[in-house]
């Protein structure tokens, strides 16, 4: 159940796709990885307000019990909904080796 | 990759699964669900610091960068990371039915 | 010694298959990615595809669909797949140690001889 | 898909002077790019990896630069073994792998 996509709180403040430029130092890979020297790194960022891109029922409860309970229970959080994969040079015990990571950049985002 | 399971903030106060008793008013169904009148609802709460229940690679990027740009990337939210079924005997229009949903109760719970 | 031995190439029909073989010695094919390379009589080289130590494939995009790289390092082998075939296929195959644009630790240059493949009816 | 664009197609030069073989790559392959030199009827040699570091067994006289798009292959005194053609090959990594080899310069005696 993917509710409303229409964001109450303005333009681009609710759960989307970001881009957020990397480099392996600011990643930590530096002593491991290769290539590529930069990661455009696609992530979720965003609030979920009310029924906002929902995606399951959970969700849906979340956001009541967030509404009575506050100070108990967060409101949804902005996370991956799907994943597209990577490939990385990556060095090994005898060399270097490419390695797909499937769950490294955000594909597409929703509240849960 | 789901890494170390020790929080440093203190016992509780990092992401794990929590049980809050909600009434079918409380989550909005009383008009479409008979059974059960209270639902006791496992959920996932409490702070991602660093590497905690990493779910994945990009788990472990996001803490990367929200060391390093706090203001732009957020840190991971504690999420469900599978779920435990429930019965709902719920109001249609021929009468009543019993419907499974899936993705009601968290079951586990990690940082992503 | 450290070995790659190519073999069974030959002559193939227009729309036919063949399976080559990259047989190696000297080291354990499960550390390793393993490329394939070939070249058409009298012109360059051209860059096929990859099976990474971890089994996962990697394809030159003309090469996606018709030809499948694979391993079986118990028998320190990996192949090469080829569905069909048409002339323009004709040229010598080579197998190569590692990703060819990084070294491995020890021997940089760890080529097969290569074996003539012939689409033609 | 990647293009490796290597320029020029055949170089003319005299035994005992600097050679410069450029490669173009399509996409940003940061230094994932290789040298080869091949000799007719032999697989290729690797003379240069991660665009700047000599293979082992490769004489003094051949160095690479570069990184991103724009690769360089230099002779510095040409001998006689190394008239033959030389390929670049890079490999281009993001959601997928793929590799290209540039088309060839050949070096020959002017």
């Known amino acids: 159940a993917r509710n409303g996509d229409h964001c109450p709180l303005g333009p681009g403040r609710c759960c989307r796709l970001h881009t957020v430029r990397a480099s392996l130092e600011d990643l930590g890979w530096a002593d491991w990885v290769l290539s590529p020297r930069e990661v455009q790194v696609t992530m979720c960022i965003g609030a979920c307000p009310s029924q906002f891109r929902a995606a399951n029922m959970h969700a849906q409860i979340k956001t009541s019990l967030h509404r009575l309970k506050p100070d108990t229970v967060p409101a949804p959080c902005c996370v991956p909904a799907s994943y597209n994969p990577m490939v990385l040079i990556q060095k090994t015990d005898t060399g270097v080796s490419l390695q797909t990571y499937d769950d490294l950049l955000a594909k597409d985002c929703h509240c849960i | 990759a789901r890494n170390g399971d020790h929080c440093p903030l203190g016992p509780g106060r990092c992401c794990r699964l929590h049980t809050v008793r909600a009434s079918l008013e409380d989550l909005g169904w009383a008009d479409w669900v008979l059974s059960p009148r209270e639902v006791q609802v496992t959920m996932c709460i409490g702070a991602c610091p660093s590497q905690f229940r990493a779910a994945n690679m990009h788990a472990q990027i996001k803490t990367s960068l929200h060391r390093l740009k706090p203001d732009t990337v957020p840190a991971p939210c504690c999420v469900p990371a599978s779920y435990n079924p429930m019965v709902l005997i719920q109001k249609t229009d021929t009468g009543v039915s019993l419907q499974t949903y899936d993705d009601l109760l968290a079951k586990d719970c990690h940082c992503i | 010694e450290v070995q790659l031995l190519e073999s069974g190439g030959g002559l193939v029909q227009p729309g036919g298959s063949l399976r080559l073989s990259c047989a190696v010695s000297?080291?354990?094919?499960?550390?390793?990615?393993m490329t394939w390379v070939r070249q058409a009589p009298g012109k360059g080289l051209e860059w096929i595809g990859i099976?990474?130590?971890?089994?996962?494939?990697y394809y030159a995009s003309w090469a996606k669909g018709r030809f499948t790289i694979s391993r079986d390092n118990s028998k320190n082998t990996v192949y090469l797949q080829m569905n069909s075939l048409r002339a323009e296929d004709t040229a010598v195959y080579f197998c190569a140690r590692g990703i060819l644009v990084y070294a491995d630790y020890g021997d940089h240059n760890l080529w097969g001889q290569g074996t003539l493949v012939t689409v033609s009816s | 898909d990647i293009v490796m664009t290597q320029s020029p197609a055949t170089l003319s030069v005299s035994p005992g002077e600097r050679a410069t073989l450029s490669c173009q790559a399509s996409?940003?392959?940061?230094?994932?790019l290789a040298w080869f030199q091949q000799k007719p009827g032999q697989p290729p040699r690797l003379l240069i990896y991660a665009a700047s570091t000599l293979a082992s067994g490769i004489p003094a006289r051949f160095s690479g630069s570069g990184s991103g798009t724009e690769f360089t292959l230099t002779i510095s005194s040409l001998q006689s073994e190394d008239f033959a053609v030389y390929f670049c090959?890079?490999?281009?990594?993001?959601?997928?792998?793929?590799?290209?080899f540039g088309q060839g310069t050949k070096v020959e005696i002017k």
């Open positions: 090959l890079g490999v281009y990594t993001y959601i997928s792998a793929e590799g290209a």
């Open positions: 000297g080291f354990s094919l499960s550390s390793y990615d």
């Open positions: 099976i990474s130590n971890s089994g996962s494939t």
């Open positions: 996409e940003d392959i940061y230094t994932n």
